[in-house]
C-alpha cells in the first residue's frame, strides 16, 4: 500500500493514485508560477532513476520558507520509505550540478508523466 495518510491523502491509496496526485500537484505548481518559484532557490540535480523519490525529497527538503512546494515535499515523503531530513544526501544526487527549483519541478514532472504513461507506478 502507498500510505500518504497524514500527509496529503485521506489514507492509504494505490500507487497509481498517489503518483497521479503528485503529478497533478507538480502541474499546479508549474501552471501557477508567476514570480520565480521559491525566490529562485537552487537545489541539487538528481538522477531520475530508481530511488528518485527519496532523492527528490532530499533535494527539495533543503528549500525552506517556500509554501509553493510544501505539499510536494509532504507527498514525496509518502513515496520515500525512510525519514529524510535537511542536509541528507544520497548517491543519486548530481553533486556538482545545482538547478533552480522551477527547473527541478519541470524535470521531475516530465519524468513522472513518462512513468505514469508507461504504467510504472511502484
Amino acid at each position: 500500500l502507498t500510505c500518504l495518510g497524514g500527509f496529503a491523502s485521506p489514507g492509504p491509496v494505490p500507487p497509481s493514485t498517489a503518483l497521479r496526485e503528485l503529478i497533478e500537484e507538480l502541474v499546479n505548481i508549474t501552471q501557477n508560477q508567476k514570480a520565480p518559484l521559491c525566490n529562485g532557490s537552487m537545489v541539487w540535480s538528481i538522477n531520475l532513476t530508481a530511488g528518485m523519490y527519496c532523492a527528490a525529497l532530499e533535494s527539495l527538503i533543503n528549500v525552506s520558507g517556500c509554501s509553493a512546494i510544501e505539499k510536494t515535499q509532504r507527498m514525496l515523503s509518502g513515496f520515500c520509505p525512510h525519514k529524510v531530513s535537511a542536509g541528507q544526501f544520497s548517491s543519486l544526487h548530481v553533486r556538482d550540478t545545482k538547478i533552480e527549483v522551477a527547473q527541478f519541478v519541470k524535470d521531475l514532472l516530465l519524468h513522472l508523466k513518462k512513468l505514469f504513461r508507461e504504467g510504472q507506478f511502484n
Partner: antibody, heavy 118, light 107 residues
Framework: EVQLQESGPGLVKPSETLSLTCTVS????????WNWIRQPPGKGLEYMGY???????YYNPSLKSQITISRDTSKNQLSLKLSSVTAADTAVYYC????????????WGQGTTVTVSS | DIQMTQSPSSLSASVGDRVTITCHAS??????LSWYQQKPGKAPKLLIY???DLHTGVPSRFSGSGSGTDFTLTISSLQPEDFATYYC?????????FGGGTKVEIK
C-alpha cells in the same frame, strides 16, 4: 448534486472522427477527474482516459493514437474525440467522475449511443 | 494491463436467495477493487469500493470481501430490484480495467 450529461451525434461514418461532449452541472470540472468509459453492445466496460482538474490528460494506451480528451471550463464541459473510427467503436459512451485521491467512479452520465456505420 | 475475470458470467436466482459473485485479478491489487451494478439501458452505479466499503445509500444486503487477487460480492437476500449485471473494477494501476460482468437473472 453533481450531474453529467453526454451528447453528440448517434451515427458516425467509418474513418471519420467521433465527437462527444459531457456537460457537468452542480459541480466544477476544475476539481476532480473527468473520465470517458465505453461499452460496446452486449459487452463489458472499457476505460478510455481522463482529463484532470488541471487539464492534464491520460489515455488508455490501447487508444492512444486515436483519442483526444479536452475541456472548456467556461462551459463546464469535457469532450471526447476519437479519430479514424471503425465498427468496433460502436458503443455506449459514458462520462464519469473520479474524485481526487480515489480510483472508483462515483458519478456517471446516462450514456450516449454511437453507431459507426456507412 | 491487469486482467479482471468474473465468474459466473450469468446466474439464475430467486428473490430471497443469497448470491455470490467472484472476481479474479491477474496480479495482486491489494484491496483496490470496486463493484458496480448496471441495469439495462442505464449507467453503472457504484456499490462497493476498497473491496468491502459500501458506497453511500447502498443497501446493507450488499457486501464485498477479498484482497490480493480474489474478491467476492455477496447479496445476502436478493430483492426484485437487484436483478442486473454486476462489474468489478481494479484501481491498482492504469489503465483501469473491468471484469466481463455477471448477469443476475430471475429463476
Amino acid at each position: 448534486e453533481v450531474q453529467l450529461q453526454e451528447s453528440g451525434p448517434g451515427l458516425v461514418k467509418p474513418s471519420e472522427t467521433l465527437s462527444l461532449t459531457c456537460t457537468v452541472s452542480g459541480g466544477s470540472i476544475s476539481s476532480d477527474y473527468w473520465n470517458w468509459i465505453r461499452q460496446p453492445p452486449g459487452k463489458g466496460l472499457e476505460y478510455m482516459g481522463y482529463i484532470s482538474y488541471n487539464g492534464n490528460t491520460y489515455y488508455n494506451p490501447s487508444l492512444k493514437s486515436q483519442i483526444t480528451i479536452s475541456r472548456d471550463t467556461s462551459k463546464n464541459q469535457l469532450s471526447l474525440k476519437l479519430s479514424s473510427v471503425t465498427a468496433a467503436d460502436t458503443a455506449v459512451y459514458y462520462c464519469a467522475r473520479l474524485a481526487k485521491w480515489t480510483w472508483y467512479f462515483d458519478i456517471w452520465g446516462q450514456g450516449t449511443t454511437v453507431t459507426v456505420s456507412s | 494491463d491487469i486482467q479482471m475475470t468474473q465468474s459466473p458470467s450469468s446466474l439464475s436466482a430467486s428473490v430471497g436467495d443469497r448470491v455470490t459473485i467472484t472476481c479474479h485479478a491477474s496480479q495482486n491489487i491489494n484491496v483496490w477493487l470496486s463493484w458496480y451494478q448496471q441495469k439495462p439501458g442505464k449507467a453503472p452505479k457504484l456499490l462497493i469500493y476498497k473491496a468491502s466499503d459500501l458506497h453511500t445509500g447502498v443497501p446493507s444486503r450488499f457486501s464485498g470481501s477479498g484482497s490480493g487477487t480474489d474478491f467476492t460480492l455477496t447479496i445476502s437476500s436478493l430483492q426484485p430490484e437487484d436483478f442486473a449485471t454486476y462489474y468489478c473494477q481494479q484501481g491498482q494501476s492504469y489503465p483501469y480495467t473491468f471484469g466481463g460482468g455477471t448477469k443476475v437473472e430471475i429463476k
